[in-house]
Interface confidence: low
Amino acid sequence: FERTRSLQDPCSNCPAGTFCDNNRNQICSPCPPNSFSSAGGQRTCDICRQCKGVFRTRKECSSTSNAECDCTPGFHCLGAGCSMCEQDCKQGQELTKKGCKDCCFGTFNDQKRGICRPWTNCSLDGKSVLVNGTKERDVVCGPSPADLSPGASSVTPPAPAREPGHSPQ
């Protein structure tokens, strides 16, 4: 079947990294510089992505695969294939149209990206606040006040809500 198909369409023999050149009797020509074809049988090569400005080259373009970009330090990728770079903020901040702004009281952000989120409401789970929240950290909920009353059985300290100082990226 493959042989039959190739007799019908000589372009199907052209491997990735080449294109089927109609101007040269459908000879398989190598992709020109700064272009690529990732599959066989293509009649054109695609232009390589250029990583410019805050974009930096993570993987160089080759004749068979496009370049891949990421962002310079101080920025992080957004969108499919890192189509955008967004400015990092500090922990305890969120990015607004006017730049990085501190989280409002009662909210926190433990990452360099994303928005400020409200502190956990411990009372909803019948617990009390063991460690107060900050702009960078959520509150840590502990046993309810009743559990800590005199004469109550010994209390095991609760595990922290998240690893102290750990900011997932």
């Epitope: 930096r56 080259t57 993570r58 993987k59 990421d70 310079t72 330090p73």
Partner: nanobody
Framework: EVQLVESGGGLVQPGGSLRLSCAAS????????MSWFRQAPGKGLEWVSH????????DYADSVKDRFTISRDNARNSLYLQMNSLRAEDTAVYYC???????????????WGQGTLVTVSS
């Protein structure tokens, strides 16, 4: 020990020119891509330009294209940024940085200078 030391900053009027220098030591300068970054007051870090080790590959941010020129002198272990037609919005601390080539596939800049302040004001 790797060292990068910028110089050449100062106060200049709009439309004027400055040439920044970055003196490198402690590594094989010609093996590394070098970049200029800047940080305007209260703003994030902005990439300005980079140049390959041999000087054959050069690129600029759109905001400085046709006004700034990056160059290097590998014999002198020096990186330069010629800044012409300066505008108020070019006011910033300018940093040179070395790209870490020991970590392929990353964009880490493993060594930075201390920065030099450029103020564009009348």
């Amino acid at each position: 020990e790797v060292q990068l030391v910028e110089s050449g900053g100062g106060l200049v009027q709009p439309g004027g020119s400055l040439r920044l220098s970055c003196a490198a030591s402690g590594f094989a300068f010609s093996d590394y891509y070098m970049s200029w970054f800047r940080q305007a007051p209260g703003k994030g870090l902005e990439w300005v330009s980079h140049i390959s080790g041999s000087g054959t590959t050069i690129d600029y941010a759109d905001s400085v294209k046709d006004r700034f020129t990056i160059s290097r002198d590998n014999a002198r272990n020096s990186l330069y940024l010629q800044m012409n037609s300066l505008r108020a919005e070019d006011t910033a601390v300018y940093y040179c940085a070395r790209e870490d080539i020991r970590m392929p596939g990353t964009t880490d800049f493993d060594h930075w200078g201390q920065g030099t302040l450029v103020t564009v004001s009348s």
